[in-house]
Amino acid sequence: PEPPTACREKQYLINSQCCSLCQPGQKLVSDCTEFTETECLPCGESEFLDTWNRETHCHQHKYCDPNLGLRVQQKGTSETDTICTCEEGWHCTSEACESCVLHRSCSPGFGVKQIATGVSDTICEPCPVGFFSNVSSAFEKCHPWTSCETKDLVVQQAGTNKTDVVCGPQDRLRA
C-alpha cells in the first residue's frame, strides 16, 4: 500500500507512517515503528504539556514570584500551567500576569465604577450631578448628595462632584 501523506487527528507523520501523538501530560520518548506504538513518558513534577504532542521536553510551570506581587491562583498539573494572580490590592499588568501594579485610586470627584480584581484595574467614573466623592479611594463609589428636604432642612450650600450639600434650618416666617 501507498505510504500515507496525511494522518488522523492525534497522529503525526514520521518515516512515511502515522504515529500516535503523546497525550497531554506526557512527552515523546520514541516514535512508533511498524511493530510498536509511540513511547511516551509523563511530565515530571513542576512540568506540563497541555496538548496532544510530539514534544521531547515538557514545559516548566510558571513561577508566581512573590517579589513581583504574584501568588498562585491555581496550581499547575501535568496537563495545565500554573495560573498566577496578584496579591490583595494589586492587579496584573498583562493577560499573562507576569507582574503586578497597585490598584489605581479614584480621585475626588470620581467614584469607583468597578472594583479592581487580581487581573483588572479599578474603573473610575466622574460623579454625576447629585453625587459626590471627597476622597481618593479604590473602593468608594460616588455618594448621593444629602437630601435636606427629608430632614426638614434646606440647602444652605450647593453640592459639587467633590462636596456634599450643606443643609441648614429653614427660615421661620414671623407672624
Epitope: 518515516n15 515523546l28 516514535d31 513511547e39 521531547t56
Partner: antibody, heavy 112, light 109 residues
Framework: SVKESGGGLFKPTDTLTLTCTVS????????ISWVRQAPGKGLEWIGI??????TYYASWAKGRFTISKTSSTTVDLKMTSLTTEGTATYFC?????????WGPGTLVTVSS | QIVMTQTPASVSAAVGGTVTIKCQAS??????LAWYQQKPGQPPKLLIY???TLPSGVPSRFSGSGSGTDFTLTISGVQCDDAATYYC???????????FGGGTEVVVK
Amino acid sequence: SVKESGGGLFKPTDTLTLTCTVSGFSLSSNAISWVRQAPGKGLEWIGIIYASGDTYYASWAKGRFTISKTSSTTVDLKMTSLTTEGTATYFCARGYTTLYFWGPGTLVTVSS
Amino acid sequence: QIVMTQTPASVSAAVGGTVTIKCQASESISTRLAWYQQKPGQPPKLLIYSASTLPSGVPSRFSGSGSGTDFTLTISGVQCDDAATYYCQGGYSSGAGTAFGGGTEVVVK
C-alpha cells in the same frame, strides 16, 4: 536500524568509546539505551540518552560511563577506568522500555 | 535504583504445554514493563511492552499481564522455537532508569 562499533581487546584502566550509529530514524525524536551482557550472564542496563539530551545511568554506572550524542546519527558510550568486569557484549537499542530495534552488539574484552 | 526479581531461573516444558514466568518490581512501575526473548549469539527480541501489548508479528501464544509490582509472561502451546532465555525489563515512569530481571531459561522437551 542501529549498529555498535568500537569493541575489541583493552587493558584494565584503559578508557574506551563505543559508538552507536542509527539509520532510518532520527535522534531528535528517539531515545537510545545502552545495555551490556557479560559472557553467559544476563542483560544489564547501563543508561539512556533522550532526544532532549537528558541522560540517566544505572547507579553502578554513574561516574564511570558517559553517554553523549556526537552527531545527528551517532551516540557514544565512553567508559573510563576499565576493569575485567567490563568484559561484555555492549548493545545499543532505540527507546526506553520498548526496545524493538537492537544492534548486533560489540564485544569488549578487558584483559591484562 | 529499581530492582526486578524474575522467577524461576529455569523452567522446562513439553511441546504444547504452558510456561509461566513471573517478574516482581521493587516498587510500583504501573505498566512500564517489557518482556524480551534472547537466543544464543543474538540480541534480545521485544515480545511484549506496556505489560501486555504484543508488537505486530509476535505470535499470540505469548501474553503478558500485571501492573504495579507483579507481572507475568505466559507462553501457551509452547513450541520448540520458544527455547530461549526470557528477560523482563521494568522502568520508572519518570524515565529516570530501568532494570532487567535476571532471566529465565526455557527448555522445551
